[in-house]
């Protein structure tokens, strides 16, 4: 049968009938039901919500809808011996101590089980010491302060201001600096954007929030015991010591009212450059310790903390597939959250639920995808993607041979300027085509597409009359299955302004006043956004569901291989004595790329011609498309980092957030200048450029006529 | 539907030991722990502790510590709570209740139906 | 440990009476307050959790609330089959504690 006859509604009606379906008001509805209390993963309401979001999408019409459960290493504070951070006299007696909660936003005080600001998966300790502060701990603000200002972080507590790269990352190397603690804050320099009050009067930061989050180095693990395998009952569980990822030091977040009391009596160094500086009425002196006055004063820091396996429930639905049922296009964002959620994860979750609502609703009409749709409720995302990787790992083989493609759905915003989108090369047309068909929720873009205003708002930086559609990076639950499987992934969400509001994600992130009022109030009243963002989430999963031909091109994975190996070439340019002494050379890199680009274009006119009536040339064009993205993952992995297997992206090592090309090759370049062996450092180049020239040849290889 | 399967009334000596029996069914055994409470004579209710079956962890009453030893058997999802050194006013019904296994729970939810134990000499 | 008043011990009323029954905690415990109800020769059914919600197959004439460290389970209108023992329990702190109970009789 064709997709036509299987599904009784011609494809351009199925799409317009499925979008709309899709309505702002449920959005708005299901939003509020989501955020009412917290959802901590690992609690009787997390699992409480797992149960009625199975409960509803069974009643949506889905075919089957299951609570998978695995047993995993969450984190939480110890109820009865709260963590904080004084500053002691010479004495030990504690002068200041950083507030035990935050103040709960206007409507509910009286909600219990509000789990207060802490740094999940710290050890417990209680280091004390002089404080340096190390801006935003990045590999670039330790160089400057170990090399350039001969400052030695041995020994200190450091404290840094949370913004531009993944908190774990800040741990990892204030670790490798020698650290005995590390204190996060978050300045309002980048959490408080100007002209804005802070909550509840606007979405700003007040000086009481405090931004919670894991502080996890996984690199793609899962569950810190498991790596690899499902923590499921007959698991085989490491010890603790030899758990994944666990930082090794105390670490602990504070607001900036608190940060003030610590920044403000610094002493030792002033700030190396204006990069240093926040928004604080505080000199940003780096230390070590405080002032002279304050010079016997140390800081201590009180964690007490404790890791614990946990029982934790993802959601997964099932809308089988009328014609291909074995081929997976998989829908999924998180549950948990920190607090209340209103933005992360439930302005995604209330999103998917829509979209369960609408497939569902075409369902009980008659209809059914062409495709298999699975549609997944994560649990635990917060403490290290734990949900998602361990349903990825206990059903890998199947996901490795079916999986088509997997949309992400946390957070449906982080502003509302314009339209955000990080994706495999293979969805930009998909990505180009529907957003031409949907219309634009911004003021000035009325009766204009969204491709105009997202264009016209965030062009790409290569190619005009393009918008701008980002490398995938990870901290969120598409690393998996992209990272690892290699199964071809997307998000989309609404942005901020980056050119204008510098500030670090959104200033509430992650804090008590993440509430559904900030979203209601302040970021979409009318919810216009995000039910744009479910049209174009629940749009390309139509699409990728739905097509006769998977609507993946190629051609596209060509334009950025040249374009990432021109970058690192470029990189590796900065050395030339040594690659003549070493003889590197890209020629073979280059010569791959070029052999993709030349099979793509190839594959991609026989595309267009094949007789498509015919269901085994059919399946067997769409398993090449499907596949293509599959023969990007070595199966070694990368160096030290053996779930991230994807050649061509990989999060970057100095940012978990941040995507890298060519990441094996980037790693082995970066700060190469100061290797003690640069004859071993330039051959771990070359290596990484022959695994990276092989590894284009061989996906280019896959679109090649199979005989 | 959840049940909480309670064993039969007991008469003891003073001194002896009695051990209840809670079995489960209905849902997922490890996925919850199961608390008991008892209750003398026309008084009110008393919670003596809690075990969750999947860690193993034991939390009691400081009342009752040194005297009461809770257990479970995954394999047959039964709980068991002994009470030694019995006393007259242990005289009382014994109860189990479900709790959920996780760090924030909103307490019992399901009740057996009681256990009499009668401590006479 | 947490001590939890509850009042009154007993009270009388009849079919259609709106019915209300406190708690006082002797310390904050947010909202980690159930209501449980007991009958004669019955399991004990837990009707509220959370201090006011509701659990599944309870009937909308019960609700609870909270003024401070006071707690109030409230039955609309009293029903034949709403005759029994009603118990508090705070489950803020270990070792959990109830209240001592409030026997609902038919005047």
């Known amino acids: 049968k064709s997709s036509n006859e299987a599904t009784n509604i011609t494809p351009k009606h199925n799409m317009k009938a499925f979008l709309d379906e899709l309505k702002a008001e449920n959005i708005k509805k299901f939003l509020y039901n989501f955020t009412q209390i917290p959802h901590l993963a690992g609690t009787e309401q997390n699992f409480q919500l797992a149960k009625q979001i199975q409960s509803q999408w069974k009643e949506f019409g889905l075919d089957s809808v299951e609570l998978a459960h695995y047993d995993v290493l969450l984190s939480y504070p110890n109820k009865t011996h709260p963590n904080y951070i004084s500053i002691i006299n010479e004495d030990g007696n504690e002068i200041f101590n950083t507030s035990l909660f935050e103040p709960p936003p206007p409507g509910y005080e009286n909600v219990s089980d509000i789990v207060p600001p802490f740094s999940a998966f710290s050890p417990q300790g209680m280091p004390e010491g002089d404080l340096v502060y190390v801006n935003y701990a990045r590999t670039e603000d330790f160089f400057k302060l170990e090399r350039d200002m001969k400052i030695n972080c041995s020994g200190k507590i450091v404290i840094a201001r949370y913004g531009k790269v993944f908190r774990g990352n800040k741990v990892k190397n204030a670790q490798l600096a020698g650290a005995k603690g590390v204190i996060l804050y978050s300045d309002p320099a980048d959490y408080f954007a100007p002209g804005v009050k802070s909550y509840p009067d606007g979405w700003n930061l007040p000086g009481g929030g405090v931004q919670r989050g894991n502080i996890l180095n996984l690199n793609g693990a899962g569950d810190p015991l498991t790596p690899g395998y499902p923590a499921n009952e007959y698991a085989y569980r490491r010890g603790i010591a030899e758990a994944v990822g666990l930082p090794s030091i105390p670490v602990h977040p504070i607001g900036y009212y608190d940060a003030q009391k610590l920044l403000e009596k610094m002493g030792g160094s002033a700030p190396p450059d204006s990069s240093w500086r926040g928004s604080l009425k505080v000199p940003y002196n780096v230390g070590p310790g405080f002032t002279g006055n304050f010079s016997t004063q140390k800081v201590k820091m009180h964690i007490h903390s404790t890791n614990e396996v946990t029982r934790i429930y993802n959601v997964i639905g099932t809308l089988r597939g009328a014609v291909e049922p074995d081929r997976y296009v998989i829908l999924g964002g998180h549950r948990d959250s920190w607090v209340f959620g209103g933005i992360d994860p439930q302005s995604g979750a209330a999103v998917v639920h829509e979209i369960v609502r609408s497939f569902g609703t075409l369902k009980k009409e008659g209809w059914r995808p062409r495709r298999t749709i699975l549609f997944a409720s994560w649990d635990a995302e917060e403490f290290g993607l734990l949900g998602s990787t361990e349903w990825a790992e206990e059903n890998s083989r199947l996901l490795q041979e079916r999986g088509v493609a997997y949309i992400n759905a946390d957070s449906s915003i982080e502003g509302n300027y314009t339209l955000r989108v990080d994706c495999t090369p293979l969805m930009y047309s998909l990505v180009h085509n529907l957003t031409k068909e949907l219309k634009s929720p911004d003021e000035g873009f009325e009766g204009k597409s969204l491709y105009e205003s997202w264009t016209k708002k965030s062009p790409s930086p290569e190619f005009s009359g393009m918008p701008r559609i980002s490398k995938l990076g990870s901290g969120n639950d598409f690393e998996v299955f992209f990272q690892r499987l290699g199964i071809a992934s997307g998000r989309a969400r609404y942005t901020k302004n980056w050119e204008t509001n510098k500030f670090s994600g959104y200033p509430l992130y992650h804090s008590v006043y993440e509430t559904y009022e900030l979203v209601e109030k302040f970021y979409d009243p009318m919810f216009k956004y995000h039910l744009t963002v479910a049209q174009v989430r629940g749009g390309m999963v139509f699409e990728l569901a739905n097509s006769i031909v998977l609507p993946f091109d190629c051609r596209d994975y060509a334009v950025v291989l040249r374009k990432y190996a021109d970058k690192i070439y470029s990189i590796s340019m900065k050395h030339p004595q040594e690659m003549k002494t070493y003889s590197v050379s890209f020629d073979s890199l280059f010569s791959a790329v070029k052999n993709f680009t030349e099979i793509a274009s190839k594959f991609s006119e026989r595309l267009q011609d094949f007789d498509k009536s015919n269901p085994i040339v059919l399946r067997m064009m769409n398993d090449q498309l499907m596949f293509l993205e599959r023969a990007f993952i070595d199966p070694l992995g990368l160096p030290d980092r053996p779930f991230y297997r994807h050649v061509i992206y990989a999060p970057s090592s100095h940012n978990k957030y941040a995507g890298e090309s060519f990441p094996g090759i980037y790693d082995a370049l970066f700060d190469i200048e100061s290797k003690v062996d640069p004859s071993k450092a330039w051959g771990e180049v070359k290596r990484q450029i022959y695994v990276a020239a092989f590894t284009v040849q061989a996906a280019a290889e896959t679109l090649s006529e199979v005989a | 539907e959840v049940q909480l399967v309670q064993s039969g009334a007991e008469v003891k000596k003073p001194g002896a030991s009695v051990k209840v029996s809670c079995k489960a069914s209905?849902?997922?055994?490890?996925?919850?722990?199961i608390s008991w409470v008892r209750q003398a004579p026309g008084q009110g209710l008393e919670w003596m502790g809690e075990?969750?079956?999947?860690?193993?962890?034991?939390y009691y009453n400081e009342k009752f510590r040194g005297r009461v030893t809770l257990t479970a058997d995954k394999s047959t999802s039964t709980a068991y709570m002994e009470l030694r050194s019995l006393r007259s006013d242990d005289t009382a019904v014994y109860y189990c209740?479900?709790?959920?296994?996780?760090?924030?729970?909103?307490?019992?939810?399901?009740w057996g139906q009681g256990t009499t134990v009668t401590v006479s000499s | 440990d947490i001590q939890m008043t509850q009042s009154p011990s007993s009270l009388s009323a009849s079919v259609g009476d709106r019915v209300t029954i406190t708690c006082r905690a002797s310390?904050?415990?947010?909202?980690?307050l159930n209501w449980l109800q007991q009958k004669p020769g019955k399991a004990i059914k837990r009707l509220i959790y959370?201090?006011?919600s509701l659990d599944s197959g309870v009937p909308s004439r019960f609700s609870g609330s909270r003024s401070g460290t006071d707690y109030t389970l409230t039955i609309s209108s009293l029903q034949p089959e709403d005759f029994a023992t009603y118990y508090c329990?705070?489950?803020?702190?270990?070792?959990?504690?109830f209240g001592g109970g409030t026997k609902v009789e038919i005047k």
């Open positions: 209740a479900r709790v959920f296994d996780g760090y924030y729970n909103y307490a019992m939810d399901y």
């Open positions: 209905g849902y997922t055994f490890t996925s919850y722990g």
């Open positions: 075990i969750f079956p999947r860690r193993g962890n034991t």
């Open positions: 310390q904050d415990i947010g909202s980690s």
């Open positions: 959370a201090t006011s």
């Open positions: 329990l705070q489950y803020a702190s270990s070792p959990y504690t």
